[in-house]
């Protein structure tokens, strides 16, 4: 039975050219996290494996940095980065938990962070 929940940074706005940290946190479960995948739409951005550490997809290595923690830092943002991001927690014995973040990259200098929220 999957009892955990993923808390994410929620809905985020950021400035073009800036950077943003995407973070998820798995709670309410004692399951062991074996790997966390970060995806943008259907593209794999990065993997953090409990044994092997981080792997950044080659096409994103210039703009994606691992961390902090299991999070991911996106740099040199463009308006094309607007969209959904997913943190996919592979755990044992629970299985897979998925969190969702929606990022809007703004042309203006006004960018505010959305509220935190939970995904069951």
């Amino acid at each position: 039975m999957m009892t955990g929940t993923i808390e994410t940074t929620g809905n985020i706005s950021a400035e073009k050219g800036g950077s943003i940290i995407l973070q998820c946190h798995l709670s309410s479960t004692t399951a062991q996290v074996t790997q966390v995948n970060w995806e943008q739409q259907d593209q794999l951005l990065a993997i953090c494996n409990a044994d092997l550490g981080w792997h950044i997809s080659p096409s994103f290595k210039d703009r994606v940095a691992p961390g902090p923690g299991l999070g991911l830092t996106l740099q040199s943002l463009t308006v094309n980065d607007t969209g959904e991001y997913f943190c996919i927690y592979h755990t044992y014995p629970d299985g897979t938990y998925t969190g969702r973040i929606f990022l809007e990259v703004l042309e203006s200098s006004v960018a505010e962070h959305g509220a935190r929220f939970q995904i069951p």
Epitope: N11, Q41, T82, G83, E84, F86, T98, R100, F102, E104, G114
Partner: nanobody, 125 residues
Framework: QVQLVESGGGVVQPGRSLRLSCAAS????????MGWFRQAPGKERESVAA????????YYADSVKGRFTISRDNSKNTLYLQMNSLRAEDTAVYYC??????????????????WGQGTLVTVSS
């Protein structure tokens, strides 16, 4: 409770166009992110397009980019999918889906709560 009813499906020749509609009943349509999905015979359901509650943000699967357009008319509680340059591989049952609220679009089926019964689109010469 949101109820979704798709229409507009049918048989069409390759290269032609078709417009699907999804009529929604329920008070929360104007705040509902929505999406179109499809399932071809013997294949898994796949995402086609998605749209935010206000239409500001849209998503398209790579296979339909440049050919399909998702839109909505909140005053009519209706979601649309304009399909141009249809191909044989677009043949499938098309479903619309909705959720009660949320920011941006939702491209993955797991986030949707409400589903229509589907409308069949057959692209054949």
């Amino acid at each position: 409770q949101v109820q979704l009813v798709e229409s507009g499906g049918g048989v069409v020749q390759p290269g032609r166009s078709l417009r699907l509609s999804c009529a929604a009943s329920g008070p929360s349509f104007s705040s509902s992110p929505m999406g179109w999905f499809r399932q071809a015979p013997g294949k898994e359901r796949e995402s086609v397009a998605a749209i935010s509650w206000d239409g500001r943000f849209t998503y398209y699967a790579d296979s339909v980019k440049g050919r399909f357009t998702i839109s909505r008319d909140n005053s009519k509680n209706t979601l649309y999918l304009q399909m141009n340059s249809l191909r044989a591989e677009d043949t499938a049952v098309y479903y619309c889906a909705a959720r009660d609220s949320g920011s941006g679009y939702y491209s993955r089926a797991q986030w949707y709560v409400y589903w229509g019964q589907g409308t069949l689109v057959t692209v054949s010469s």
